[in-house]
Every structure is written in C-alpha cells, then in structure tokens.
Interface confidence: medium
C-alpha cells in the first residue's frame, strides 16, 4: 500500500475547508492515551432540520493510481442517546470526490462533487482509550476509480448527524 493522505500524520492543523465557515464542521484537537494530539473534525447540529454541512480536504495527488481507497475512522452518536432530537437527528454522512488537475481550487460547487457512498456506523467498532474515556471508533473503507486527472479532493457532507472524523487515510495498492 502507498499512502497518499493520512490525517493522523499531518503536523499542526489540517486546515480543511468547511462550508458554512461557522456552525458546521469544526476542527477539534483531542488527546490520545499517550497525550498526543489528534486532529479531528466534528459536527453535532442534531436539533436543526435540513443540515447541509460540507468539509473538503486539500488536493490529493493520485500518483498515477487508477483506483484509490479511502479509510475513514469516525465516531457517530446514536440518535437515541441524544434526548429529544428524533425528528432532526441523522445517523449517516455522505462521502464525495472531485477530480482536478488544479491543486489550488478555491471554490468547488456542491454539484461538481461525485458521490462515493452514504456512510453509516457499523455494528462493529474498535474501543479506543482517549484519556479518561473510551471512544467507539468505526472504520469504513471505500474505493473510487478509475481516476484520470492528476489528483482529487474528498468531501464529507453532514446532513444532521453527531459525528467526529478521527482519521482519514487515502492509499492505493501497488500492483
């Protein structure tokens, strides 16, 4: 495997683009059991209907790979654990990509992104010790291809869930 992006290995802030700029996805640093900061993106607007919060990564080079794999580690709160929000709370988010030769796209319209999948929390999860609490970490892998341009952007659409993206890794498999 060749890693193209690993959010856990980025030094400092990830600085991905959130839309809207406020009130949607927020970058939050948490500490793991070794007191090492983990950069996460979180959103939890479970009381308001019609949420449409987007988060997009920086440009990711494909390095000639035809097909890439996206591994997402995330937590997603069960709506039953959030009192009084059953009408508005969701338990999924959407994953998109946009191919581009431009590594500095300033603005990408929502309708330019291609949907990869709707992601839901699996029944299986890994328990991770984060300081004084246990975090239930889901892992989902999706693939996309064939790719033709020099690189691409990933985007995450929240539609009203209580979610934290803990790790995003993009890789391809060597032949």
């Amino acid at each position: 495997e060749v890693t193209l992006l690993d959010s856990r290995s980025v030094q400092g802030e990830l600085g991905w683009i959130a839309s809207p700029l406020e009130g949607g996805w927020e970058e939050v640093s948490i500490m793991d059991e070794k007191n090492t900061p983990i950069r996460t993106y979180q959103v939890c607007n479970v009381m308001e209907p019609s949420q449409n919060n987007w988060l997009r990564t920086d440009w990711i080079t494909r390095e000639g790979a035809q097909r890439v794999y996206i591994e997402i580690k995330f937590t997603l709160r069960d709506c039953n654990s959030l009192p009084g929000v059953m009408g508005t709370c969701k338990e999924t988010f959407n994953l998109y990509y946009y191919e581009s030769d431009n590594d500095k796209e300033r603005f990408i319209r929502e309708n330019q992104f291609v949907k990869i999948d709707t992601i839901a929390a699996d029944e299986s999860f890994t328990q991770v010790d984060i300081g004084d609490r246990i975090m239930k970490l889901n892992t989902e892998i999706r693939d996309v291809g064939p790719l033709s341009k020099k690189g691409f952007y990933l985007a995450f659409q929240d539609v009203g869930a209580c979610i934290a993206l803990v790790s995003v890794r993009v890789f391809y498999k060597k032949a």
């Epitope: 009130g23 927020e26 939050v28 996460t40 609490r133 979610i163 934290a164």
Partner: nanobody
C-alpha cells in the same frame, strides 16, 4: 471526573423570566458543544438548546424565540436565558456536554427546578 452544577431555577409566573447557570469542571468543556436539557415529571429528558464551540446556537421548537443559550469558556459556564415562560416549561433543567466522541450522559448534575405558575 466531570462535575456539573446547575443553578438559577425557581418559581415564576407565566410570562416571567429566569436565567439558569451551569458550572462545569473536570474536563475542558471549551472543546465541546454544550446543551441544556429538561425533564418534566413522567416524561423523557429532552434537549432544548445547544451552543457549539464557535458559539452557534440551536433550539428545539418549543423554546425557539423565547430561550437563549450562551457560554463563557473563560469561566467554564453555560447559561440559559428563559423569557416569556409558560406553565409547560415547568421541569428540572440540566446542562451537559454534547460530544460526538463519546456519550457524556453518564455524568449529570443535580439539575435546577423551574416552576411556572399560571
């Protein structure tokens, strides 16, 4: 250990106002959205207001336009300004963190009783 202490409740006539306060300690609550919840006798606890780290607010429909949530991270405090109170607002009011990372709801403060008389 997370500790939450709500205060500011009381008895008030319909149409009156109250300001609830919540003191949070034992965790960096500035890292989380915070919410106010309430529970009337014989009903489930419901979330009525939330404020994100950035200060964005969300409200449940029954309190929208009447209640205002705010936070002061320097003091680790969360507030709920309640105006134009109605008898159906009578309940015990609680605050808590709203985190996607884990379920905070094994920690609850004692709450503060709000009674609205008609």
């Amino acid at each position: 250990q997370v500790q939450l202490q709500e205060s500011g409740g009381g008895v008030v006539q319909a149409g009156g106002s109250l300001r609830l306060s919540c003191a949070a300690s034992g965790r960096a609550f500035s890292s989380y959205a915070m919410g106010w919840f309430r529970q009337a006798p014989g009903t489930k606890r419901e979330m009525i207001a939330a404020v994100t780290r950035a200060g964005t607010t969300n409200y449940a429909n029954p309190v929208k336009g009447r209640f205002t949530i705010s936070r002061d991270d320097a003091k680790n405090m969360v507030y709920l300004q309640m105006n134009n109170l109605k008898p159906e607002d009578s309940a015990v009011y609680y605050c808590n963190a709203i985190s996607p990372l884990w379920d905070e709801y094994d920690f609850w403060g004692p709450g503060t009783q709000v009674t609205v008389s008609s």
